[in-house]
Interface confidence: medium
């Protein structure tokens, strides 16, 4: 005898009622009399509900079961399951006989959506841009288990310092918990989804934190106005410092060093102590200073890279912050200076003079002049390269026609440093070469 | 009319870098991040990084860390992508797009046209 | 890295068949995005977060799935869909894309 039965499993929401589906094709002549059938669960063979002897016998299963009696002899052995639970999930075997014997087993799958994501965020009250705070994702009475996801305001996602935990309650639906931990910058969203894998159903809850700005009457924080210039290869002292009233002590501290654009940690001292540095190893506090209110960090080895804006951030009981800006700078080498021709020339014929400078920072600014001082403006081309250490090579080309005699020269200027290389070449009215010979 | 217009052609050297631009016109540029994607010759799409041109933030993909820089300028809405130390498998066309959306779903809505870089000796 | 792998690399279809391009990830994602890329052109959006069409897209493309399992499906194929397939994710870094299927009309 064929039984038929879907082969996908029934999805059912909690609470609802479920149709387990199941059919048989009854022979011509066929009466109620002469069959047998019986739903029972696949794993356990419990019975759940069962028609023999002409009759219906009833739910054995909680009293929540019942048969489509109407259908029965159109070959429906189709059973309903009311008020589902997360308990009922499981195979349902449907056993039909007549003069023949047939079954197969229907999955029941359980679902529940999740609700809206409540956020709480931990601390919530003054905040600051640098504070570590929880933001907790709570999702209630879903089934079966949820994933969750969080993302910043921008869809980037959030993997690191996230703690998820999803507990059943007596009616085994789960409430999920997802706690975010995070170092807050100037503001920022977070996003979290709650998804169920079931129902392919996403709840999702977000939350926007805005820092207060220091207020005045504050930690008074100070830095220099001007940006701190440094060489490239040697180390910087960013300069910053607080007031700290009388019997204060480091205990009391958090300070906190970051990048003011990416808000990417530099380096920090916290519950007492220094907790290191987060950029490459090459910072460092001057800790014998601190309780005096000496929060400058020290940067070793000076990059290129390292140039833009460091906001030091002092917490004690109130909260202060200023940013500090780093210029890096290299100077530029002595420009060398090559001709092309470089031989036979006289008055008359076009020539181009480049003036050659390696390995400055920031980009330079070119000058050229002739042998009395006056600018040469027309006719020239200056490219700068950066190499991989981010320093520039400047190449500045002078396409000139020769006079009788004439001096040209180049100059090199680092607007940083306010550091000029110069660099001539002069060119006599007889048939020469360049460089002169011996 | 939203658009990214990237800047024309490159053939380079081994062992140099390219710095690609893309013109973003028809939107408030700060409002949304661009992310540049490769592709090298008859094979699939590659995640370079992304820039937000408000914050200025960057994240690469770590494949390409040391060697590729993104930049934005605001004045000019455009963004930039360089990638230093060429070789000759970075032979791809290089394509900037914007990530749309809303949270907590985000996509590629609008591409560049592309920009074919040829590393070669 | 969520490495996204699509099946199948190839599939040669003729005019009005169904066609099904599955995209399996090495772990869960929170959604899924697809885009067409046509010879010569720049990939353009197609389905946006699993199941919903992006804007001008015809109605015979629909996307479902999720966890690590989706799938886009192409109801009566027409000519102008002869084109290469991605699946993209961006729940956990870096951001990833399917290796592609490039689909050829008969």
């Known amino acids: 005898l064929e039984v038929q039965v879907p082969e996908d499993p029934v999805v059912a929401l909690v609470g609802t009622d479920a149709t387990l589906r199941c059919s048989f094709s009854p022979e011509p002549g066929f009466s109620l009399a002469q069959l047998n059938l019986i739903w029972q669960l696949t794993d356990t063979k419990q019975l759940v509900h069962s028609f023999t002897e002409g009759r219906d016998q009833g739910s054995a299963y909680a009293n929540r079961t019942a048969l489509f009696l109407d259908l029965l002899a159109q070959g429906n052995a189709s059973l309903r399951l009311q008020r589902v639970r997360v308990a009922d999930e499981g195979s349902f075997t449907c056993f039909v006989s007549i003069r023949d014997f047939g079954s197969a087993a229907v999955s029941l799958q359980v679902a529940a959506p999740y609700s809206k994501p409540s956020m709480t965020l931990e601390p919530n009250k003054d905040l600051r841009p640098g504070d570590t705070v929880t933001i907790t994702c709570s999702s209630y009475r879903g089934y079966p288990e949820a994933e969750v996801f969080w993302q910043d305001g921008q869809g980037a996602p959030l993997t690191g310092n996230v703690t998820t935990s999803q507990m059943a309650n007596e009616q085994g639906l789960f409430d999920v918990h997802s706690v975010l931990r995070v170092v807050l910058g100037a503001n920022g969203t977070y996003s979290c989804l709650v998804r169920n894998p079931v129902l392919q159903q996403d709840a999702h809850g977000s939350i926007t934190i805005t820092p207060q700005r220091s207020p005045t009457g504050a930690v008074e924080v100070q830095v220099p106005e001007d940006p701190v210039v440094a060489l490239v290869g040697t180390d910087a002292t960013l300069r910053c410092s607080f007031s700290p009233e009388p019997g204060f002590s480091l205990a009391q501290l958090n300070l906190i060093w970051q990048l003011t654009d990416t808000k990417q940690l530099v380096h920090s001292f916290t519950e007492g102590r220094d907790q290191g540095s987060a950029y490459a190893n090459r910072t460092a506090l001057f800790l014998d200073l601190l309780a005096q209110g000496n929060a400058s960090l020290r940067l070793q080895r000076v990059r290129v890279a390292d140039e833009g804006s460091f906001t030091c951030f002092v917490s004690i009981r109130d909260f202060g912050s200023a940013a500090v800006s780093l210029q890096v700078a290299a100077p530029y080498s002595k420009p060398s200076m090559t001709l092309e021709p470089n031989k036979d020339l006289r008055p008359g014929d076009t020539v181009t003079i480049t003036c050659s400078s390696y390995r400055g920072y920031p980009e330079a600014e070119v000058f050229w002049q002739d042998g009395q001082g006056a600018p040469l403006t027309g006719n020239v081309t200056t490219s700068q390269m950066a190499n991989e250490q981010g320093l520039f090579d400047v190449h500045s080309v002078l396409r000139v026609v020769l006079g009788a005699n004439g001096t040209y020269s180049c100059l090199v200027r680092n607007p940083v440093l306010q550091q000029d290389a110069h660099g001539s070449v002069t060119i006599t009215g007889q048939p020469m070469t360049f460089p002169p010979e011996a | 009319e939203v658009q990214l217009v990237q800047s024309g052609a490159e053939v380079k050297k081994p062992g140099s870098s390219v710095k690609v631009s893309c013109k973003a016109s028809?939107?408030?540029?700060?409002?949304?991040?661009i992310h540049w994607v490769r592709q090298a010759p008859g094979q699939g799409l590659e995640w370079m990084g992304y820039?937000?041109?408000?914050?200025?933030?960057?994240d690469y993909n770590q494949k390409f860390k040391d060697r590729v820089t993104i930049t934005a300028d605001k004045s000019t809405s455009t963004a930039y992508m360089e990638l230093s130390s060429l070789r000759s498998e970075d032979t791809a066309v290089y394509y900037c797009?914007?990530?749309?959306?809303?949270?907590?779903?985000?996509?590629?809505?609008?591409w560049g046209q592309g920009t074919t870089v040829t590393v070669s000796s | 890295e969520i490495v996204l792998t699509q099946s199948p690399d190839f599939q040669s279809v003729t005019p009005k068949e169904k066609v099904t391009i599955t995209c399996r990830a090495s772990?869960?994602?929170?959604?899924m995005n697809w885009y067409q890329q046509k010879p010569d052109q720049s990939p353009k959006l197609l389905i946006k977060?699993?199941?919903n069409l992006a804007s001008g897209v015809p109605s015979r493309f629909s996307g479902s799935g999720s966890g690590t399992d989706f799938t886009l499906t192409i109801n009566s194929l027409e000519a102008e869909d002869a084109a290469t397939y991605y699946c993209?994710?961006?729940?956990?870094?870096?951001?990833?894309f399917g290796q592609g299927t490039k689909l050829e009309i008969k």
């Open positions: 797009a914007r990530y749309s959306g809303s949270t907590p779903y985000w996509y590629f809505d609008v």
């Open positions: 028809g939107y408030s540029f700060t409002s949304y991040t």
């Open positions: 820039i937000n041109p408000n914050s200025r933030n960057t």
């Open positions: 772990s869960s994602v929170s959604y």
């Open positions: 977060a699993t199941s």
């Open positions: 993209q994710q961006w729940s956990s870094n870096p951001l990833t």
